[in-house]
């Protein structure tokens, strides 16, 4: 969780107006202080005891799990994934049964052929990972294959993924169109039959930081929000500090509860705090009000 | 994996004579082979081309000189060079198509094999 300011005081007004009794605590730092006595109670929101603290179940923690982290670790995939699966029809190549079995001399540099083909005509997209034979067949040399793309994930990755698998279709298609066979001659390194171009299918990885987020936060989900910084999802709850969502507290401590976040406010030697963001302060001694 | 080994070159005069041979280590049968040609200083060029069914092409440089032939038994191509030019000077290699290669009835740039080659010098 990201860093929040340590609150020194135990007195506490909530903002609707009582005083309440809480521990000393940054919000961010779980307590391991041991408890002595029936630990299976202790450990509440369906933490389990140890042997020697509470281990508390995603959003929880504190000393018996009574607490709601300010932000939920999630992670996004490293990179992100698209696969579309082509067929093509290579006319350059007779068709005989050994293109079926893998292991054969004949599929084993039809493989290496096509493929250098297929990275001959995808040079231009950096997404592109490569292909992949997934079946041959009769007419002449039918190519089922997947074209493999992959880019780092950012918020939107999908409309990269979209953009690359459209740049693969314009390709394959210009290529299927150039490189055909004339007059019985193919002087390219493979030639196609342009009406055998498909796309059959297009499977995008679906990552989504707001369903993760929510799912993580249980029945807080409703005050669990992400956020970006530096295009990395941040799960928090307006109690995180740094945010657009964050809550400011002013004079008090944020605690998110399961109506959402509020304010508990503080009591010092001098005032009293008050107000949905605790930023109404009351002189004790002239019982003064300030803003 | 096809090892293709040249032989057969060396110097020559001008209007003479020179055939060369390549050695294939498996079945050619089922392959398009060819001769290219890299001159110094110069790409690689395609001098001649035979198909499975033995239909050749040749590059406009060469024909009516050169004739490409092919003995599928002895899994061997050959060049037969005659009324050699100075300009015919340049490393010779033969290459062998993936198989069952179709299409190569004309100069075909498709061979995923290659020899290291033969310099054949051409020189009064």
């Known amino acids: 969780p990201l860093a929040t300011i340590p609150v020194s005081t135990t007195s506490l007004t909530s903002s609707e107006g009582s005083t309440i009794s809480t521990p000393s605590v940054d919000i961010s730092t779980p307590v391991t202080t041991s408890i002595v006595g029936d630990q299976c109670s202790r450990c509440k929101n369906g933490g389990f005891w140890d042997g020697l603290k509470c281990q508390c179940l995603t959003p929880y923690y504190g000393e018996s799990c009574e607490e709601v982290v300010n932000s939920i670790d999630i992670a996004p995939p490293e990179t992100v994934s698209a696969q579309m699966e082509l067929t093509v029809t290579v006319t350059s190549v007779k068709f005989t049964d050994e293109l079926k079995n893998h292991s054969s001399q004949e599929f084993r540099e039809f493989n290496k052929t096509f493929t250098e083909q297929m990275n001959i005509v995808y040079s231009g997209i950096p997404e592109y990972v490569g292909v992949n034979i997934t079946n041959l067949r009769l007419g002449s040399v039918v190519v089922e294959h997947d074209v493999l793309l992959r880019t780092k994930y950012t918020p939107e990755y999908k409309t990269a993924l979209d953009n690359a698998t459209e740049v693969v279709k314009q390709k394959i298609t210009k290529v299927t169109t150039e490189q055909i066979m004339t007059n019985d001659n193919c002087s390219a390194l493979m030639c196609f039959n342009t009406t055998g171009t498909q796309v059959q299918n297009i499977t995008v990885t679906q990552y989504d930081p707001v369903e993760e987020c929510r799912q993580k936060a249980e029945e807080y989900e409703d005050y669990f929000l992400v956020e970006y910084r530096d295009q990395k999802p941040y799960c928090i709850s307006p109690c995180e500090s740094g945010f657009n969502a964050s809550k400011n507290c002013n004079h008090g401590k944020c605690q998110m509860s399961q109506n959402g976040a509020r304010c508990l406010c503080v009591t010092t030697e001098t005032h009293w705090y008050s107000g949905e963001d605790c930023n109404q302060g009351t002189q004790k001694s002239h019982h003064h009000h300030h803003h | 994996e096809v090892q293709l080994v040249e032989s057969g070159g060396g110097l020559v005069q001008p209007g003479r004579s020179l055939r060369l041979s390549c050695a294939a280590s498996g079945d050619i049968t089922r392959r398009c082979m060819g001769w290219f040609r890299q001159a110094p200083g110069k790409e690689r060029e395609g001098v001649a081309g035979i198909s499975e069914d033995g239909i050749t092409g040749y590059a406009d440089s060469v024909k009516g000189r050169f004739t490409i032939s092919r003995d599928n038994a002895k899994n061997s191509l050959y060049l037969q060079m005659n009324s050699l030019r100075a300009e015919d000077t340049a490393l010779y290699s033969c290459?062998?198509?993936?198989?069952?290669?179709?299409?190569?009835?004309?100069?075909?740039?498709?061979?995923?094999?290659r020899g290291q080659g033969t310099m054949v010098t051409v020189s009064s």
């Open positions: 290459a062998a198509s993936i198989l069952n290669r179709v299409g190569c009835r004309q100069l075909s740039y498709e061979y995923i094999y």
